[in-house]
């Protein structure tokens, strides 16, 4: 039960990529507004997105304080013109979100190939170390900073003239691969956290091919 003309939020869903984290829910409000609260399992509730008509709330600033914590959010529904009004139990109608542990669950954003350099029959491919919104000592940490040894990259590469793909893996942000002399290759990378059970892999990066601007070729 709740206040007349208010309905509880439902379908509370966490949308999170590289720790940018938004809670979404339904329904679109009709004559009601929402307030969101977030808490760790052992912490106090903190209110965000006060009396909003949106059906999403950016909770990034809260979860980046400790991405290894497990968070719970709840969405309160209030009548649009009377936010002091409460339900029959003496408090506004609300719905709980699923639990969310950013470190284990945030989606890995699409990586970018920063550069590639050919020296003879070797090519060094470097993946951009993407910045996250996690901070330490007032600086933003990179994806590698945050995930450390848990993060690997998979490189897919193939001759421009064929479709047969090869793969390589690295626990850094660099690959050194052998290529055939005189052949042009294309590259795509994927971020992977092998230890995860969900959201283990990012989408593939945009394809970059030799003979285009991003790379460098040196004949030794």
């Amino acid at each position: 039960s709740g206040t007349t003309n208010t309905v509880a939020a439902y379908n509370l869903t966490w949308k999170s990529t590289n720790f940018k984290t938004i809670l979404e829910w339904e329904p679109k409000p009709v004559n009601q507004v929402y307030t969101v609260q977030i808490s760790t399992k052992s912490g106090d509730w903190k209110s965000k997105c006060f009396y909003t008509t949106d059906t999403e709330c950016d909770l990034t600033d809260e979860i980046v304080k400790d991405v290894k914590q497990t968070y719970l959010a709840r969405v309160f529904s209030y009548p649009a013109g009377n936010v002091e009004s409460t339900g029959s139990a003496g408090e506004p109608l609300y719905e709980n979100s699923p639990e969310f542990t950013p470190y284990l669950e945030t989606n890995l954003g699409q990586p970018t190939i920063q550069s590639f350099e050919q020296v003879g029959t070797k090519v060094n491919v470097t993946v951009e170390d993407e910045r996250t919104l996690v901070r330490r000592n007032n600086t933003f940490l990179s994806l590698r900073d945050v995930f450390g040894k848990d993060l690997i990259y998979t490189l897919y590469y193939w001759k421009s003239s064929s479709s047969g793909k090869k793969t390589a893996k690295t626990n850094t942000n660099e690959f050194l691969i052998d290529v055939d002399k005189g052949e042009n290759y294309c590259f795509s990378v994927q971020a992977v956290i092998p230890s995860r059970t969900v959201n283990r892999k990012s989408t593939d990066s945009p394809v970059e091919c030799m003979g285009q601007e991003k790379g460098e070729f040196r004949e030794i």
């Epitope: 290894k68 914590q69 497990t70 284990l104 330490r136 940490l141 945050v146 450390g148 040894k149 230890s195």
Partner: antibody, heavy 121, light 109 residues
Framework: EVQLQQSGAEVMKPGASVKISCKAS????????IEWVKQAPGQGLEWIGE????????KYNEKFKGRVTFTADTSTNTAYMELSSLRSEDTAVYYC??????????????WGQGTLVTVSS | QAVVTQEPSLTVSPGGTVTLTCRSS?????????ANWVQQKPGQLPKGLIS???NRGPWTTARFSGSILGDKAVLTLWGAHTEDEAVYYC?????????FGGGTKLTVL
């Protein structure tokens, strides 16, 4: 406050199995790797392997593969190490450990008090 | 499997500075090895000093500092105290496993 509390000493016969527990408190158990480390009498530290409780993902030192199994119970915040086919050279103190995480960091910051396993006929 | 090598023993005078090194048999130590330094005093439990190359634990005095110097990981201790006498272990990460060095017995004399 992060704490790792291990089970008590065990005296085992050769060929038997032993299961050691490591109960964690003061942090989100599922998100941190638990490391297992062996220290034989008068010897240095030797890494046995690790488990990430939230996903049950494990990694093992090749030397112990096949004889050691890690499990974790997230409902009780407890990690377990089972070592089978015990022999005299398994006599050692076994530690669980966890890293200190401040945005990024990995390894062996917090340690349990150790469990002495003695293998003797 | 890689071998991690440390000086078996070092001696430092009280108030002095000492550098402990950690070498890898596979080549240069990098930040991807996430070097750890663990202190173990006689008859005591191990205690983590540094993890992830240079991250001090909240209990680690600022007299200890971790870094990479050239091709090795180093632990530098400034202003040594007698209570710093211990065995110091280095551990390095290799893609899917940790390897501990044999330890350096540090004497403050």
């Amino acid at each position: 406050e992060v704490q790792l509390q291990q089970s008590g000493a065990e005296v085992m016969k050769p060929g038997a199995s032993v299961k050691i527990s490591c109960k964690a408190s003061g942090y989100t158990f599922s998100s941190y790797w638990i490391e297992w480390v062996k220290q034989a009498p008068g010897q240095g530290l030797e890494w046995i392997g690790e488990i990430l409780p939230g996903s049950a993902s494990t990694k093992y030192n090749e030397k112990f593969k096949g004889r050691v199994t890690f499990t974790a119970d997230t409902s009780t915040n407890t990690a377990y190490m089972e070592l089978s086919s015990l022999r005299s050279e398994d006599t050692a103190v076994y530690y669980c450990a966890r890293d200190y995480y401040y945005g990024s960091s990995y390894g062996f910051a917090y340690w349990g008090q150790g469990t002495l396993v003695t293998v003797s006929s | 499997q890689a071998v991690v090598t440390q000086e078996p023993s070092l001696t430092v005078s009280p108030g002095g500075t000492v550098t402990l090194t950690c070498r890898s048999s596979t080549g240069a130590v990098t930040t991807s090895n996430y070097a750890n330094w663990v202190q173990q005093k006689p008859g005591q439990l191990p205690k983590g000093l540094i993890s992830g190359t240079n991250n001090r634990g909240p209990w680690t005095t600022a007299r200890f500092s971790g870094s990479i110097l050239g091709d090795k990981a180093v632990l530098t201790l400034w202003g040594a105290h007698t209570e710093d006498e211990a065995v110091y272990y280095c551990a390095l990460w290799y893609s899917n496993h940790w390897v501990f060095g044999g330890g350096t017995k540090l004497t403050v004399l």
